[in-house]
């Protein structure tokens, strides 16, 4: 391949290693398992007041949840960090998928079942327009034991 | 609750280095942008740059040749190095958090330390 | 290099209406610079009142309110009081993640 695609593979590289996409992977399951609760009762009924005072002085969010998630501050948060960790491959759109793959491996584990792993897939396809970010136009996320060939 | 707390020397002398660190505490600084602002005595607002945890940086355009912002995740903190300093230089140092509003790209500073003042003189 | 423009001062009386303007040396400012606007006490650190326009703040009296006024972002203060007396700021957020202070404007309430 050519050099300057061998550079940007490293500078990838080196950036999702500097990057910390704990905070979606939090967002994403939190967002799943109440879908998941919510069939049955009213899907924006607040489990939290988002300005009330919760143990973890990090949670305590001054903005009100955003449209997409109107149940508590504790993963408003967790939006927002994991959007400004994707605001970061905002500019290299090929690397972008990479982290989105990253998540989707990091979490294949703990999902449960098909239906649960497509949910969060089609969640994850979601986040970077959720951000407010151009999502990669092509992103496999589709997850293998043995591996994939990414591209 | 989330506190922001600079530290440094008071007084740096002409030509040298300005080196000051932001201190976060009741909080993590992980995932987060953080900034460095300035006020000259009387004067107004002058922003620094801003730094994100992985250490991507965007400085001010007419301070960039001076400027460098440094993080480290691990002891909470965030630093500003400014060289080369001249009395222009003499100003209140302020560190910001900034804040996104998801999903938009509207940013502004919802968090400040009290500010340092330092002092550029011989 | 870009330059915002602010009032340098500017006053209004004891339950009156005043605007604060936010403007470029070059162009007008629209939404998409999200203008916001902080409050400085002298002597304290600054505190946002409004931004991305028009949101106040966490706490900000209803009193203040932004807006785009022709080409220029504008913080509006109804029913002004004694303790609104200090320095206001807008800034404007540029590409490349570079922010813009403006000159500040210094309100008195007679």
């Known amino acids: 391949r050519q050099q300057w695609e061998l550079q940007g593979d490293r500078r990838c590289q080196s950036q999702l290693e500097r990057a910390n996409l704990r905070p979606c992977e939090q967002h994403l399951m939190q967002k799943i398992q109440r879908d998941e609760d919510s069939y049955g009762r009213d899907p924006y009924s607040p489990s939290q007041d988002p300005y009330s005072p919760s143990q973890d002085p990090d949670r305590r969010d001054p903005y009100s949840p955003s449209p997409y998630d109107r149940r508590g501050a504790g993963s408003s948060q967790h939006q927002e960090r994991c959007c400004n960790e994707l605001n970061e491959f905002e500019n290299n759109q090929r690397c972008m998928c990479e982290a989105l793959q990253q998540i989707m491996e990091n979490q294949s584990d703990r999902l449960q079942g098909r239906q649960q792993e497509q949910q969060f897939k089609r969640e994850l396809r979601n986040l970077p327009q959720q951000c407010g970010l151009r999502a990669p136009q092509r992103c496999d996320l589709e997850v293998e034991s043995g591996g994939r060939d990414r591209y | 609750q989330v506190q922001l707390q600079e530290s440094g020397p008071g007084l740096v002398k002409p030509s040298e280095t300005l080196s000051l660190t932001c201190t976060v505490s009741?909080?993590?600084?992980?995932?987060?942008?953080w900034t460095w602002i300035r006020q000259p005595a009387g004067k107004g607002l002058e922003w620094i740059g801003r730094?994100?945890?992985?250490?991507?940086?965007n400085y001010n355009p007419s301070l960039k040749s001076r400027v460098t912002m440094s993080v480290d995740t691990s002891k909470n903190q965030f630093s500003l190095h400014l060289t080369s300093v001249t009395a222009a230089d003499t100003a209140v140092y302020y560190c910001?958090?900034?804040?996104?509003?998801?999903?938009?790209?509207?940013?502004?500073?919802?968090?400040w330390g009290r500010g340092t003042r330092v002092t550029v003189s011989s | 290099q870009t330059v915002v423009t602010q009032e340098p001062s500017i006053s209004v009386s004891p339950g009156g209406t005043v605007t604060l303007t936010c403007g470029l040396s070059?162009?007008?400012?629209?939404?998409?610079?999200?203008p916001s606007w902080y409050q400085q006490i002298p002597g304290q650190a600054p505190r946002t009142l409004i931004y991305?326009?028009?949101t106040r703040s966490s706490g900000v009296p209803d009193r203040f309110s932004g807006s785009i006024l022709g080409n220029k972002a504008a913080l509006t203060i109804t029913g002004a009081q004694a303790d609104d007396e200090c320095d206001y700021y807008c800034?404007?957020?540029?590409?490349?993640?570079?922010?813009?202070f403006g000159g500040g404007t210094k309100l008195t309430v007679l």
């Open positions: 910001a958090r900034l804040r996104r509003v998801v999903p938009t790209a509207i940013w502004h500073f919802d968090l």
């Open positions: 009741g909080g993590s600084i992980s995932s987060y942008y």
């Open positions: 800034v404007l957020y540029m590409d490349s993640g570079v922010m813009v």
């Open positions: 730094i994100f945890t992985t250490g991507s940086t």
């Open positions: 991305g326009t028009n």
């Open positions: 070059s162009g007008a400012v629209s939404t998409s610079y999200f």
